[in-house]
């Protein structure tokens, strides 16, 4: 079948999800496409515990997550509600800064060197994290 009951090689399992941590950089859209090619998505952070887990693995390096406001409001790539969900922005962020001189504002969110979030130009080649959930069917206890 197509059920994913365990994490692929080189992925890290944590709380019924699998995570893969890149060691190179891509623009946000290319990182998003890469994760989708792996039947996954850019990481969606839903709790302080998950934040600490990801932060531990990426270290002090700018790293894309699956959060953007390219179409207006901030949205998580898997549909998780942004307004009611976990947030960990740096002070004064997001600021949609236009002063970088690259054209436009800042529409994609990343982990900064201290783990807190910042919005930045989506074309910057940052590292990224993919996440995929283990199948719900596989989480049910076996019938006796």
């Amino acid at each position: 079948g197509s059920e994913r009951t365990c994490c692929p090689v080189n992925w890290v399992e944590h709380e019924r999800s699998c995570y893969w941590f890149s060691r190179s950089g891509k623009a946000w859209a290319d990182a998003d496409n890469y994760c989708r090619l792996e039947d996954a998505h850019l990481v969606v952070v839903t709790s302080w515990e998950e934040q600490k887990f990801v932060q531990h693995h990426i270290g002090p390096v700018n790293t894309w997550m699956g959060l953007h406001d390219q179409n207006g409001p901030w949205k998580w790539v898997d549909g998780t509600d942004y307004e009611t969900g976990f947030k960990n922005w740096r002070p004064e962020q997001p600021d949609d800064w236009y002063g970088h001189g690259l054209g436009g504002g800042e529409d994609c969110a990343h982990f900064t060197d201290d783990g807190r979030w910042n919005d930045d130009v989506c074309q910057r080649p940052y590292r990224w994290v993919c996440e995929t959930e283990l199948d719900k069917a596989s989480q049910e206890p076996p019938l006796l």
Partner: antibody
């Protein structure tokens, strides 16, 4: 040994349809994204389409978007390319190819190719 | 789309020569680049992946270098079986794009 074998090519009239197949063996098919690449007679290589291992995501070159559909049947270890509204410029040898993962788990495209199947679009 | 400009489009060389082929990307692609060899009527064969990693089973006279926008394939000592067409491929961004090819012919 990794093997991919294309089939389904042939002569078709402009506006017609054709479905290519690629039978894979020697690796865990569902764990790998797969691609189609084509080569017009006497020309260079052109990437056509890609699909994720479980089929959840697909990607297309602009030249074929809306006309070609990539799919896979992991129970049969087979990749497909459904080609509709064919044009003379689609005439090419079509190759099926898989990628590989490096030691960090990063995917690199196109390490094993089939021998190709020729599609000729002509009236 | 990322354009891959490959040069030269053709070259003539002798057995034992050192041959260098270049690919230039229209924007940075990190090291998401492979090099392929194709002989007439045959499927392409990957020689190099990740810009500089040698594919298993490929002779060590083939090497790749570069990162970002400039990449090079070098054949340190050309052998008779190396006369073929060579292509680069970038996979940093969709659509994937190939260079136009370099035909290596016998002088």
């Amino acid at each position: 040994e990794v093997q991919v074998l294309e089939s389904g090519g042939g002569l078709v009239q402009p506006g017609g349809s054709l479905r290519l197949s690629c039978a894979a063996s020697g690796f865990t098919f569902s764990s790998y994204a797969m691609s189609w690449v084509r080569q017009a007679p006497g020309k260079g290589l052109e990437w056509v389409s890609a699909i994720s291992g479980r089929g959840g995501s697909t990607y297309y070159a602009d030249a074929v978007k809306g006309r070609f559909t990539i799919s896979r049947d992991n129970s049969k270890n087979t990749l497909y390319l459904q080609m509709n509204s064919l044009r003379a410029e689609d005439t090419a040898v079509y190759y099926c190819a898989k990628g590989s993962y490096d030691s960090s788990g990063y995917y690199h495209y196109l390490d094993h190719w089939g021998q190709g199947t020729l599609v000729t679009v002509s009236s | 789309d990322i354009q891959m400009t490959q040069s030269p489009s053709s070259l003539s060389a002798s057995v034992g020569d050192r041959v260098t082929i270049t690919c230039r990307a229209s924007q940075g692609i990190e090291n998401d680049l492979g090099w392929y060899q194709q002989k007439p009527g045959k499927a392409p064969k990957r020689l190099i992946y990740a810009a500089s990693s040698l594919q298993s089973g490929v002779p060590s006279r083939f090497s790749g270098s570069g990162s970002g926008t400039e990449f090079t394939l070098t054949i340190s000592s050309l052998q008779p079986e190396d006369f073929a067409t060579y292509y680069c491929l970038q996979h940093n961004s969709y659509p994937l794009t190939f260079g136009g090819g370099t035909k290596v012919e016998i002088k």
